[in-house]
């Protein structure tokens, strides 16, 4: 595929990535799938500058990111290393809380109303952010 050189309509460019901010809510898996269908992924926060950028755009609203521990260890959806990477958890989080009564623990990460992160039940219908890198090859066939 051809290399994407500018962001799609209604996406916002920042530091060679493109971001799309939802205004409705979905479960984490549905949000993840939505981004994949857009040839993108749920946002992967790799730096303090990226954290601040996303936070400015989403405001004080619970919003999914591309971080989960559904298979054990915490993993970013694009393979970015979690252990050595940027983290911005709220105090005492993640806590894999079981007391919500919805079955299981909390396996998906989201931005809270103050921007710091929390783990929550993946079925909750939160807003989400998709991200795609400008320098990666797009899956669309080149125009002839």
């Amino acid at each position: 595929g051809s290399e994407r050189t500018c962001c799609p309509v209604n996406w916002v460019e920042h530091e060679r990535s493109c971001y799309w901010f939802s205004r409705s809510g979905k479960a984490w898996a549905d949000a993840d799938n939505y981004c994949r269908l857009e040839d993108a992924h749920l946002v992967v926060v790799t730096s303090w500058e990226e954290q601040k950028f996303v936070q400015r755009h989403i405001g004080p609203v619970n919003t999914w990111m591309g971080l989960h521990d559904q298979n054990g260890p915490w993993k970013w959806v694009d393979g970015t290393d979690y252990e050595t990477g940027f983290k911005n958890w709220r105090p005492e989080q993640p806590d894999d809380w079981y007391g919500h009564g919805l079955g299981g623990g909390e396996d998906c990460a989201h931005f809270t109303d103050d921007g710091r992160w929390n783990d929550d039940v993946c079925q909750r219908p939160y807003r989400w952010v998709c991200e795609t890198e400008l320098d990666k090859a797009s899956q669309e066939p080149p125009l002839l």
Epitope: S47, W48, G115
Partner: antibody
Framework: QVQLVQSGAEVKKPGASVKVSCQAS????????MHWVRQAPGQGLEWMGW????????NYAQKFQGRVTMTRDTSISTAYMELRRLRSDDTAVYHC??????????WGQGTLVTVSS | DIQMTQSPSSVSASVGDRVTITCRAS??????LAWYQQKPGKAPKLLIY???SLQSGVPSRFSGSGSGTDFTLTISSLQPEDFATYYC?????????FGPGTKVDIK
């Protein structure tokens, strides 16, 4: 112009607490995170944490967790850093610094905290 | 935590000299690095942010370069007011960390 003006020098005994203030002017106080950085005599710089004056969220360096509290009063555009259970090795100059792009773009003049019995 | 190292730890130079200070991060920080100048008894002053962007009001003889793990601060022609200690700092992830400093003094 942006200015960060800190409170005056303090002398404390081991085990006591100190609260340093940092009054901001020349910009929208709630629009930028405020960091605290300390420097022991003749030593390098050590980041302590930040507060978001807009929503009161904080993030403290693990080394200071449980001993430090950062607060703010938006009505007077002032950030505060309280450090408890002081030890002699907490003797340092404490600076507030405004969050910039991958940097601290403006710094307070510093507050010397001396811990001595 | 990300460790920051600087070299040299001190350098003796003369007015007009070109001075280069290097900073290395223990893991990749992309371009999220700042450089500060500090004089005795004063607060640090921001010179360079995002590895190569010159802070407003800072003379153009200061420049920064690098990305990933290796970074450089260059003073193209040292002036009398440049004798100071210089620190690099990573602002990629918490805890933010500083290099140990490089003292530039008069030869």
């Amino acid at each position: 112009q942006v200015q960060l003006v800190q409170s005056g020098a303090e002398v404390k005994k081991p085990g006591a607490s100190v609260k340093v203030s940092c009054q901001a002017s020349g910009y929208t106080f709630t629009g930028y995170h405020m960091h605290w950085v300390r420097q022991a005599p003749g030593q390098g710089l050590e980041w302590m944490g930040w507060i978001n004056p807009n929503n009161n969220a904080t993030n403290y360096a693990q080394k200071f967790q449980g001993r430090v509290t950062m607060t703010r009063d938006t009505s007077i555009s002032t950030a505060y850093m309280e450090l408890r259970r002081l030890r002699s090795d907490d003797t340092a100059v404490y600076h507030c610094a405004r969050d910039g792009t991958s940097s601290f773009d403006y710094w307070g003049q510093g507050t010397l905290v001396t811990v001595s019995s | 935590d990300i460790q920051m190292t600087q070299s040299p730890s001190s350098v003796s130079a003369s007015v007009g000299d070109r001075v280069t200070i290097t900073c290395r991060a223990s893991q990749g920080i992309r371009k999220w690095l700042a450089w500060y100048q500090q004089k005795p008894g004063k607060a640090p002053k921001l010179l360079i942010y995002a590895a190569s962007s010159l802070q407003s009001g800072v003379p153009s003889r200061f420049s920064g370069s690098g990305s990933g793990t290796d970074f450089t601060l260059t003073i193209s022609s040292l002036q009398p007011e440049d004798f100071a200690t210089y620190y690099c700092q990573q602002a990629n992830s918490f805890p933010f960390t500083f290099g140990p400093g490089t003292k530039v003094d008069i030869k």
